[in-house]
Interface confidence: medium
């Protein structure tokens, strides 16, 4: 009775730094009893690992089980679907989960005024699951980038963007006042992760902030 | 001294797209920030785009962000303006111009930051 259920259409990782989400779709006309079994194979260690045997969601975090990740050659995961003694075939992962793989985000973005500059102090994430020496900058040593916009309001220009090479930038506001809210998004430039645009955050700027020399 | 000449416009149906180049003689854009403004019949010039000459900061009006990318080419010393989805609203007169320096600020979203000026070129587009 091995191979009465479809299988699962599709598997892939979501990951971003120590977050490491397995995805799948489900399979059509599943029943209440269907759950789907993951399994992990590390490359160098040809043999898979059965992770979880009836998960019912359609995702499972893999971060505990991956945290070498960053200093391996990667993972391909599986899924298949179960019901009762039937089970469909194994669906497998189309590429090798990797570091490559893991889309780069910042942890937040904090902004203050100075004498007419906005100042930005960019902060690496620090995930809890993250052993303790894998850092962000640790992992990442080298060619850090970080795609800047910035949005005035009110005003009818939005958008400045501007690659920085550090995890501070200052953007000269020319006597402009208003609200100035800022993303940022990382790179390596280096490498060829995706990088997420961060959350958006707002400073006001009145003319209290300009210094007046005569 | 920076001589600015702007080509490519004309008249297109909306939805259409066109590309306006801008040519400097004189001297070259290195060290400049250069952009592009443009002015409807009755109206106030208004900021489009702009572009560090290094290629480090772009600036973006509200009214074409997505739409519309700038881009310049060192070696020919040209300035691009590569529009899409146009609108009847984006008619208007199209200048190229340039200023000195390529600090990341805001001033280069204002005409008055900008020393050296093109003659302008037209573009139409009909609904």
């Known amino acids: 009775h091995g191979t009465e259920l479809p299988s699962p259409p599709s598997v892939w990782f979501e990951a971003e730094f120590f977050h490491h989400i397995l995805h799948w779709t489900p399979i059509p006309n599943q029943s209440e009893s269907t759950c789907y079994e993951v399994a992990l194979l590390r490359y160098g260690i040809e043999s898979w690992n059965s992770i979880s045997n009836c998960s019912q969601t359609l995702s499972y975090d893999l971060t505990a089980v991956t945290l070498d990740l960053y200093h391996s050659n990667g993972y391909r995961a599986r899924v298949r679907a179960v019901d009762g003694s039937r089970h469909s075939n194994w669906t497998v992962t189309n590429t090798r989960f990797s570091v490559d793989e893991v889309t780069l985000t910042v942890g937040s973005v904090n902004l203050e005024i100075h004498n007419g500059f906005i100042l930005g102090k960019i902060q690496l994430p620090r995930p809890k699951m993250a052993p303790a020496n894998d850092t962000y900058e640790s992992i990442f040593s080298h060619f850090r980038e970080y795609e800047i916009a910035i949005r005035k309001v009110p005003g009818n220009f939005t958008f400045t963007h501007k690659k920085v090479k550090h995890e501070n930038f200052s953007l000269l506001t020319s006597g402009e006042v208003g609200e100035f809210c800022v993303q940022v998004k990382p790179s390596v430039a280096s490498r060829s992760n995706k990088g997420m645009w961060s959350k958006e955050e707002c400073i006001s700027l009145t003319r209290q902030y300009f210094t007046v020399t005569n | 001294q920076v001589q600015l000449q702007e080509s490519g416009g004309g008249l297109v149906q909306a939805g259409d797209s066109l590309r306006l180049s801008c040519a400097a003689s004189?001297?070259?854009?290195?060290?400049?920030?250069v952009g592009w403004f443009r002015q409807a019949p009755g109206k106030e010039r208004e900021f489009v785009a702009a572009?560090?000459?290094?290629?480090?900061?772009?600036y973006f009006g509200d009214s074409v962000k997505g739409r519309f990318t700038i881009s310049r080419d060192s070696a020919k010393n040209t300035l691009y303006l590569e529009m899409n989805k146009l609108k009847p609203e984006d008619t208007a007169v199209y200048y190229c111009?340039?200023?000195?320096?390529?600090?990341?600020?805001?001033?280069?979203?204002?005409?008055?930051?900008?020393?050296?000026w093109g003659q302008g070129t037209q573009v139409t587009v009909s609904s």
């Open positions: 111009a340039a200023a000195t320096g390529q600090e990341w600020s805001l001033q280069y979203l204002r005409e008055s930051s900008y020393a050296y």
């Open positions: 004189g001297r070259t854009f290195s060290g400049y920030t």
């Open positions: 572009i560090t000459w290094n290629g480090d900061t772009t």
